[in-house]
Interface confidence: low
């Protein structure tokens, strides 16, 4: 239904606290360099304006769209061109082109320092002095670094952050309480960021239909007792919600997400037997809980998939009369039977089934032609299963750090032109798949591994798209979203690459490495490893092990030395010479 004032409508639906949080996220995702203080001023102005519209929907400007109101606010910022260059050109455009222009200027890799967590005492002091401002800073810092973060979910993580601080800041050992809990929130939030970026990429590159297919498969796995019509309704709603968030319509997105949660809780009987615990929670937790819900039990009496999709004499007629519906039903029926498959795999199977019907239904004897289609799925299923098996075995053998290094070598060989920081980030994230997925029960491994890898590879594609340097990466990134992971897996050493010259300074280290946290130390070592591979793309595993082992010993020795600087200065050149020799 239409509202006189959209901003008043959203303010009333969301409530002041969530409204302000979402407006702050929106501004932080659009103007990623602005300081918190500048954004919070705009948020307050927008909130005050929304309140005047709630009091009187006919008040001046209350009938304007939210894009118009937000865009006008952003464009009124002084020195916009000085700070944002080209983005200021967007302000010359009218809506909806202006918003499109803002979206195109979102930077997936903004030049911002890594978010440093203050030490425990300082954190607790500022949290207790002003919790609202403290959590506002959290929203701002995360949103500006992740301009596609799913806004209602970010509000949920801020709530979690709040809970952790409320609990831990009363403890005697604040750091011991805070560190593991905040690490867990951070890890979940980072995974959520890459997953949502993948959804926005899917929407941007392949449109709503592709996202809806993803949603149908996912919902069918989770809710195998729901009817196809119900799954279609949920998938359609979820597509609309994600389109809004990816498009910067954060207030509408959060409002619609809450509506969907309400609908699901009011219709549990036709959706899933597992929803009740989620439905007892407050709105943000309810939506998050529903998004993470465990799969319902598969109905016991499901007939073979072959009955309707292979053996039925009307297959081609059904397909011809309503292609999308027939394929949607196939995806639904296959997915609800296979919670043990990744969504990417299910979509590849549906694509294979569609291609088979396209070919066979045009031939003289269609049933004879498509009769073997289910058997033809076998290699498509085996490929990711083998990937999971070999990678989880490697992870179990090497541990997370060693596994990351193995992936780093592999990916540097596949795409040596890609910048070292990007390769290190990708390998570290890809390597986390072991810790995240390989410890799960067998039936959950494949969906966990493949769907997580797909999201991380999407991040690699997004970064590469900004400055394309590798034809192979461009090829894998340009194809269909569901074929990306197999495409990257199939890449081999890039034979066209001319090895980098050996530069001694790349492998020269100083005593500052000794005081770095473990994570930063690892990144330094992995940076050196990637550079080694770029210098010697065909180095054997043993050669690399020797050099990296030597390097680790060198760092260890010099960090224990009485005169660290002297040790690094004298031992460093020896290490470089030995490394060159080992790789010759």
């Amino acid at each position: 239904e239409a509202h006189k004032s959209e901003i008043a409508h959203r303010f009333k639906d969301l409530g002041e606290q969530h409204f302000k949080g979402l407006v702050l996220i929106a501004f932080s995702q659009y103007l990623q360099k602005c300081p918190y203080e500048e954004h919070i001023k705009l948020v307050q102005e927008v909130t005050d304006f929304a309140k005047t519209c709630v009091a009187d929907e006919n008040a001046e400007n209350c009938d304007k769209s939210i894009h118009t109101l937000f865009g006008d606010k952003l464009c009124a910022i002084p020195k916009l061109r000085d700070n944002y260059g080209e983005l200021a050109d967007c302000c010359a455009k009218q809506e909806p082109e202006r918003n499109e222009c803002f979206l195109q200027h979102k930077d997936d890799n903004p030049n911002l320092p890594p978010f440093q967590r203050p030490e425990a005492e300082a954190m607790c002091t500022s949290f207790q002095e002003n919790p609202t401002s403290f959590l506002g800073h959290y929203l701002h810092e995360v949103a500006r670094r992740h301009p596609y973060f799913y806004a209602p979910e970010l509000l949920y993580y801020a709530e979690k952050y709040n809970e952790v601080l409320t609990q831990c800041c009363t403890e005697s050992d604040k750091a011991a309480c805070l560190t593991p809990k905040l690490d867990a929130v951070k890890e979940k939030a980072l995974v959520a960021a890459v997953r949502q970026r993948m959804k926005c990429s899917s929407m941007q590159r392949f449109g709503e239909r592709a996202f809806k297919a993803w949603a149908v498969a996912r919902m069918s796995q989770r809710f195998p007792n729901a009817e196809f019509a119900e799954i279609t309704k949920l998938a359609t709603d979820l597509t609309k919600i994600n389109k809004e968030c990816c498009h910067g319509d954060l207030l509408e997105c959060a409002d619609d997400r809450a509506e969907l949660a309400k609908y699901m809780c009011e219709n549990q009987a036709t959706i899933s037997s597992k929803l009740q615990a989620c439905c007892d929670k407050p709105v943000l937790q309810k939506s998050q809980c529903l998004a993470e819900i465990e799969h319902d039990n598969i109905p016991a009496d499901l007939p073979s998939i072959a009955a309707d999709f292979v053996e039925d004499k009307e297959v081609c007629k059904n397909y011809a009369e309503a292609k999308d519906v027939f394929l949607g039903t196939f995806l639904y029926e296959y997915s609800r039977r296979h919670p043990d498959y990744s969504v990417s795999l299910l979509l590849r199977l549906a694509k294979k089934y569609e291609a088979t019907l396209e070919k066979c239904c045009a031939e003289g004897d269609p049933p004879a032609c498509y009769g073997t289609v289910l058997a033809e799925f076998q290699p498509l299923v085996e490929e990711p299963k083998n990937l999971v098996k070999t990678n989880c075995e490697l992870y179990e053998k090497l541990g997370e750090y060693g596994f990351q290094n193995a992936i780093l070598v592999r990916y540097t060989q596949k795409a040596p032109q890609v910048s070292t920081p990007t390769l290190v980030e990708a390998a570290r994230n890809l390597g986390r798949v072991g810790t995240k997925c390989c410890t799960l029960p067998e039936a959950q491994r494949l969906p966990c591994v493949e769907d997580y890898l797909s999201a991380i590879l999407n991040r690699l594609c997004v970064l590469h798209e900004k400055t394309p340097v590798s034809e192979k990466v461009t090829k894998c990134c340009s194809g269909s979203l569901v074929e990306r992971r197999p495409c990257f897996s199939a890449l081999t050493v890039d034979e066209t690459y001319v090895p980098k010259e050996f530069k001694a300074e790349t492998f020269t280290f100083h005593s500052d490495i000794c005081t770095l946290p473990d994570k930063e130390k690892q990144i330094k070592k992995q940076t050196a490893l990637a550079e080694l591979v770029k210098h010697k793309p065909k180095a054997t595993e043993d050669q690399l092990k020797t050099v990296m082992g030597d390097f680790a010993q060198f760092v260890d020795k010099c960090c224990k030395a009485a005169d660290k600087d002297n040790c690094f200065a004298t031992e460093g050149p020896n290490l470089v010479a030995r490394s060159k020799e080992a790789l010759a």
């Epitope: 729901a226 009817e227 196809f228 019509a229 119900e230 279609t232 309704k233 219709n267 009987a269 036709t270 309707d308 059904n318 009369e321 309503a322 999308d324 519906v325 027939f326 949607g328 039903t329």
Partner: nanobody
Framework: EVQLVESGGGVVQPGGSLRLSCAAS????????MGWFRQAPGKERERVVS????????YYADSVKGRFTISRDNSENTVYLQMNSLRPEDTALYYC????????????????WGQGTLVTVSS
């Protein structure tokens, strides 16, 4: 052989009510979404309401929302259409239809059709 047999049509005054029934045979009723369509003289056939195979999901055309209610009894292989506050523009031949695969419920997705039952709203 699949058969859909409608009943319950007739003449009624504006503001009155009717209950249409559709009895199905020759198909696994609980595997089919069911719908009611109508065709007024000289007009295209239009979808009025439909209900998914378990009854958990329904669709109503805007023109009948709040006045018509669809329901089904899978144990009796029957679908019902309760029509209240009838108007002269509801006058039409009402068809019952069954769909094996139903998402949007447009006409071409329905596989089996009944012969229709006539509803006339007139004072």
């Amino acid at each position: 052989e699949v058969q859909l047999v409608e009943s319950g049509g007739g003449v009624v005054q504006p503001g009155g009510s009717l209950r249409l029934s559709c009895a199905a045979s020759g198909l696994t009723f609980s595997s089919y979404a069911m719908g009611w369509f109508r065709q007024a003289p000289g007009k295209e056939r239009e979808r009025v309401v439909s209900i998914s195979r378990g009854g958990g999901y329904t669709y109503y055309a805007d023109s009948v929302k709040g006045r018509f209610t669809i329901s089904r009894d899978n144990s009796e292989n029957t679908v019902y259409l309760q029509m209240n506050s009838l108007r002269p523009e509801d006058t039409a031949l009402y068809y019952c239809a069954a769909a094996r695969y139903w998402a949007t419920g447009s006409e071409y997705e329905f596989d089996y059709w009944g012969q229709g039952t006539l509803v006339t709203v007139s004072s």
